[in-house]
């Protein structure tokens, strides 16, 4: 094949390679970047800054070499259009720094950064901690700052990512308040703060206030529906992210539903309760106390973790008509008490006759003794015994 | 698998007390009720009581209420029978057994207990 | 509480007999449980629900009753069934036991 006289050049299917002297001073309009998987750059001294337009229609991009030229920043969402990429080789060139940011997302099974006169500072600590947990291939490489030595040796006691605090209301809140958070930010270096509020939804009236290092966020008219969801503070600096999550107990009535008694291995009479605290549960069958054991017990569901309501079944295990009756469930927390009640049969009770009387027995065509629809005496059965035990 | 591991043989004076621990592992300790039975030798079995470790539930036989006493710990998944003024006619093999929705589907391997002056 | 008789409290057999233990309520119960011990073992879960078989238990062992009249049936007596078996009520509080059945060969 003929030499090819362009800057960049295909390699294999979806490969390129750009290793003409100085042909490059940034990435934009590369040839079918959309399919590359590997691009190959070298010898490129104007190539100085990559940065997220450079990269942005390499998709597939798995590997990507950059060696022996001009890089001296690279930004810190420079791959945030390269979900894919693997492979991240930049030696050789004049990199002193690298943010966290640019790797944080990615899968890096390879980090090549040997022949860069990197300086030693907190914002390498992330770099740092790959060599010592031998991540990306990094320990092989044996890294140097520029007069400083190597980066194993930095110190990095007063590298920390930021603290944070957020201080929520210990007194009780109810439905209808408006409730006042404040995270407050300690740390080296601050960049960046903020809140997360996506489990809120209609949860509350949202407020931002405040900036660095103390935000401040204003939760208005607050639903039952707050309770359970996480409220979370983010602050980032050149060590890193710190995030802290907080729950707002949000103070409303106990609340029951029962349901019809199904027969799932067993029986189970399911129940819906709510209530902030989690109310206290007692049944009563037939207005008494009902005493559980290992054959009638309160089982519940898993809960789901963003919500309040517990889901269950009273269960019975062998009932019989001695179980048959009304069931009530009281479920009661400091702020309010509530009741449901349901029938259940769950066996007919063979003695519901005189005892005096013939035993009632319905026509079946195999019973050859009678040869009518009417009751027959059957005297040959053992007699059916009427006491019952109640636990 | 489901296994109850108890405790080993004990030896111990009348009006001492005992405590017999019944390990749990192959299972999800806290929905399971927790039985103990024992035997005496050469006799029947006899329900001592049942403890949910889900909400720590207890139920005893009438004739144990003031003497034995049934704990657990849900971090070890473990449950404890503890029988205190024993007399020679305590000495029985222990057993404790879960259930759920079925009877005392799983046993362990019984712990001897010997009540002697 | 409920007291659980059984009968007979032991009995001589032979292989290939047909086998049957009762158990008696002193009140009505919703079911009966069975379990087998041989010595120095713990019981075994053997019927359940009055008939339904624990597993690994042979087809030749059944259970029926209800009420306060209980059995257990073995059709064909095999070696490895001389054990003792118990009966049990799991219907109230305190729960009870039979006394026993001890399974001997003649």
């Known amino acids: 094949a003929a030499p090819c006289p362009d800057a960049c050049c295909p390699h294999g299917s979806s490969g390129l390679r750009c290793t003409r002297d100085g042909a490059l001073d940034s990435l934009h309009h590369l040839p079918g970047a959309e399919n590359l998987t590997e691009l190959y750059i070298e010898n490129q001294q104007h190539l100085q800054h990559l940065e997220l337009r450079d990269l942005r229609g390499l998709g597939e991009l798995r590997n990507l070499t950059i060696v022996k030229s001009g890089l001296r920043f690279v930004a810190p969402d420079a791959f945030h259009f390269t979900p894919r990429l693997s492979r991240l080789n930049l030696s050789f060139n004049a990199l002193e720094s690298l943010s966290w940011k640019t790797v944080q997302g990615l899968s890096l099974q390879e980090l090549v950064l040997s022949g860069n006169p990197l300086h030693c500072s907190c914002a390498l600590r992330w770099l740092q901690r790959w060599e010592e947990e031998g991540l990306g291939g990094v320990p092989e490489q044996k890294l140097q700052c520029h007069g400083q030595g190597p980066l194993a040796h930095m110190p990095n006691a007063s590298c920390g990512v930021p603290t944070l605090k957020v201080q929520v209301p210990n007194a009780s809140v109810d439905v209808g308040d408006d409730v006042l958070l404040r995270c407050q930010v300690e740390g080296r270096g601050l960049e960046q703060a903020g809140w997360i509020l996506t489990e809120l939804e209609q949860s509350a009236t949202v407020m931002k206030s405040g900036g660095l290092p103390s935000l401040g966020l204003t939760l208005a008219n607050v639903t039952s529906d707050l309770n359970r969801k996480n409220v979370t503070c983010w602050a980032e600096n050149d060590v890193g992210r710190a995030e802290v999550s907080v729950q707002v107990n949000v103070s409303f009535p106990a609340s029951v539903q029962l349901h019809t008694a199904v027969e799932m291995h067993h029986w189970c009479i399911p129940f819906s309760v709510d209530g902030q605290p989690a109310p206290s549960l007692r049944w009563l069958f037939n207005g008494s106390v009902l005493n559980e054991t290992s054959f009638i017990f309160t089982e519940f569901l898993e809960p789901a973790a963003n919500e309040t309501v517990r889901h269950g079944c009273l269960r019975l295990n062998q009932p019989t008509h001695v179980n048959n009756g009304n069931y009530t469930l009281l479920a009661a927390n400091p702020f309010g008490q509530a009741s449901a009640s349901i029938m259940a049969a769950f066996m007919d009770n063979p003695f519901e006759f005189n005892p005096e009387d013939p035993i009632p027995v319905s026509f079946s065509p195999v019973d050859t003794n009678s040869t009518s629809g009417d009751p027959v005496e059957k005297k040959d059965e053992t007699p059916f015994g009427v006491s019952v035990a109640v636990g | 698998q489901v296994q109850l591991v108890q405790s080993g043989a004990e030896v111990k004076k009348p009006g001492s007390s005992v405590k017999v621990s019944c390990k749990s592992s192959g299972y999800t300790f806290t929905n399971y009720w927790m039985h103990w039975v024992r035997q005496a030798p050469g006799q029947g079995l006899e329900w001592i009581g049942e403890?949910?470790?889900?909400?720590?539930?207890?139920n005893y036989n009438e004739k144990f209420k003031n003497r034995a006493t049934l704990t657990v710990d849900i971090s070890t998944s473990t449950a404890y029978m503890e029988l205190s003024s024993l007399r020679s006619e305590d000495t029985a093999v222990y057993y404790c057994?879960?259930?759920?929705?079925?009877?005392?589907?799983?046993w362990g391997q019984g712990t001897t207990v010997t009540v002697s002056s | 509480q409920v007291q659980l008789t059984q009968s007979p409290s032991s009995l001589s057999a032979s292989v290939g007999d047909r086998v049957t233990i009762t158990c008696s309520a002193s009140?009505?119960?919703?079911?009966m449980h069975w379990y087998q011990q041989k010595p120095g073992k713990a019981p075994k879960r053997w019927i359940y629900d009055t008939s339904k078989l624990a597993s690994g238990v042979p087809s030749r062992f059944s259970g029926s009753g209800s009420g306060t009249d209980y059995t257990l049936t073995i059709s064909s007596l095999q070696p490895e069934d001389f054990a003792t078996y118990f009966c049990?009520?799991?219907?109230?509080?305190?729960?009870?036991f039979g006394q026993g059945t001890r399974l001997e060969i003649k």
């Open positions: 049990q009520q799991w219907s109230s509080i305190p729960l009870t």
């Open positions: 057994a879960r259930s759920r929705y079925d009877p005392m589907e799983d």
């Open positions: 009140s009505s119960v919703g079911y």
């Open positions: 403890i949910y470790p889900n909400n720590g539930r207890v």
